[in-house]
């Protein structure tokens, strides 16, 4: 049974998320992966990785680093000096083309809020990597991590295909905040 | 409490595979990733690869692929590294740990298994 | 792959002193390190992630400093119980890598 939930990760302006997707390497090693944004009804593509995809060969399109681990079956996605209008719903898909995608999981709730000056999150290269341990409060000052809802409905059939192959989505109500790093 | 048991030791011949189990408990199993770290006698630290408990995907490092496979039994909470065409160089302590969350670029292993040691003679 | 070069190898130190080791990246891997101690005979234990994040529980005379390719992990008064190896380790890139090890004695 794969659990399908919503992950939400809250920052300060000048953050970097850093997240990871992973993926069948048998299936999608070869694959080109995208990382795109759900605007409304259309997800919009803000990079891609080539094909086909070399061992740490980056793909930097702006503030957005993508790089794919082939022999690992991990894509990496970093967004540096994150500003509040990034916040939304992302996702790593397998990119074929624009109208048939498989989603990986899980889709990441950005929530980006402007930072007080001089807190850790308002310098501008500092960094978040999300810990482990749940507990019931986020650290202070710090960015948090959250799962807090559960993904109720795929992107439109129009311009995605969810795809699980072998597994039976289990939808589950997650309300973990997770305590963070904050790095300057 | 959070914890990782793994099964007890092993001692196999070269050519033959071995199977160690790590029972995770204390914590949504799905959430986590679980990582394998080996350490032969008097050794450093070796990492030998990942697995999402929650997609069932899992990748290795270059030296074992084809060698090591990864599996889980959601139902039981515990995740499988079997390692075939074993080598006496094979002989170590081998450990799972839990990852950072699956989605989250951060291998910190916050929580390890007690080691399973496996022998590899002829 | 990413090195990772740990030094001193051994060390032998008094109860009380400040105590220092390094580890160097071959390549910068930012603030993407860890830190753990392991005693012998037992899993190894996270200490300080990313390079210098106390990890809970963990006591306060550790600490870990750096960023880039130079990375210093400090006991600053070393007691008995601190007899172990320490290991960093990088997850900048993959594969991951751990440094060789640092023993750290009791004089």
């Known amino acids: 049974t794969t659990e399908l939930t919503e992950e939400k990760y809250e920052y300060k302006e000048g953050q970097t998320l850093e997240v990871k997707c992973d993926y069948a390497l048998e299936k999608y090693a070869n694959s080109r992966k995208a990382w795109q944004k759900m605007e409304g009804k259309m997800p919009k593509i803000l990079a891609k990785t080539e094909r086909p995809s070399e061992n740490s060969h980056p793909v930097q399109v702006g503030r957005i680093t993508l790089e794919d681990y082939p022999d690992h079956g991990l894509l990496q996605v970093r967004m540096t000096n994150l500003q509040v209008e990034d916040s939304g719903l992302y996702q790593c898909v397998i990119y074929q083309h624009p109208k048939e995608s498989h989603v990986l999981f899980n889709p990441i709730c950005l929530v980006v809020t402007k930072g007080s000056s001089g807190t850790p999150g308002s310098s501008e290269n500092s960094t978040q990597n999300v810990y482990r341990t749940p507990s019931t409060t986020a650290k202070a000052l710090g960015p948090r991590y959250t799962s807090p809802r559960t993904v109720t409905q795929a992107p439109p059939e129009s311009t995605v295909v969810v795809s699980t192959p072998g597994s039976e989505i289990n939808l589950t109500n997650v309300t973990d905040i997770i305590r963070v790093p904050v790095f300057n | 409490q959070v914890q990782l048991v793994q099964s007890g030791a092993e001692v196999t011949k070269p050519g033959a595979s071995v199977k160690v189990s790590c029972k995770a408990s204390?914590?949504?199993?799905?959430?986590?990733?679980i990582n394998w770290v080996r350490q032969a006698t008097g050794q450093g630290l070796e990492w030998m690869g990942w697995m999402n408990p929650n997609s069932g995907n899992s990748g290795s490092v270059q030296k074992f692929r084809g060698r090591v496979t990864m599996t889980r039994n959601t139902s039981i909470t515990t995740v499988y590294m079997e390692l075939s065409s074993l080598r006496s160089d094979d002989t170590a302590v081998y450990y799972c740990?839990?990852?950072?969350?699956?989605?989250?670029?951060?291998?910190?292993?916050?929580?390890w298994g007690q080691g399973t040691m496996v022998t590899v003679s002829s | 792959d990413i090195q990772m070069t740990q030094s001193p190898s051994s060390l032998s130190a008094s109860v009380g002193d400040r105590v220092t080791i390094t580890c160097q990246a071959s390549?910068?891997?930012?603030?993407?390190l860890n830190w753990y101690q392991q005693k012998p005979g037992k899993a190894p234990k996270l200490l300080i992630y990313g390079a210098y994040t106390l990890e809970t529980g963990v006591p306060s005379r550790f600490s870990g400093s750096g960023s880039g390719t130079d990375f210093t992990f400090t006991i600053s008064s070393l007691q008995p119980e601190d007899i172990a190896t320490y290991y960093c380790?990088?997850?900048?890139?993959?594969?991951?890598?751990f440094g060789g090890g640092t023993k750290v004695e009791i004089k």
């Open positions: 390549q910068d891997i930012n603030n993407h």
């Open positions: 740990a839990r990852g950072g969350i699956s989605s989250s670029w951060h291998w910190a292993f916050d929580i």
């Open positions: 380790q990088q997850y900048d890139k993959l594969p991951l890598t």
């Open positions: 204390g914590y949504t199993f799905t959430r986590y990733d």
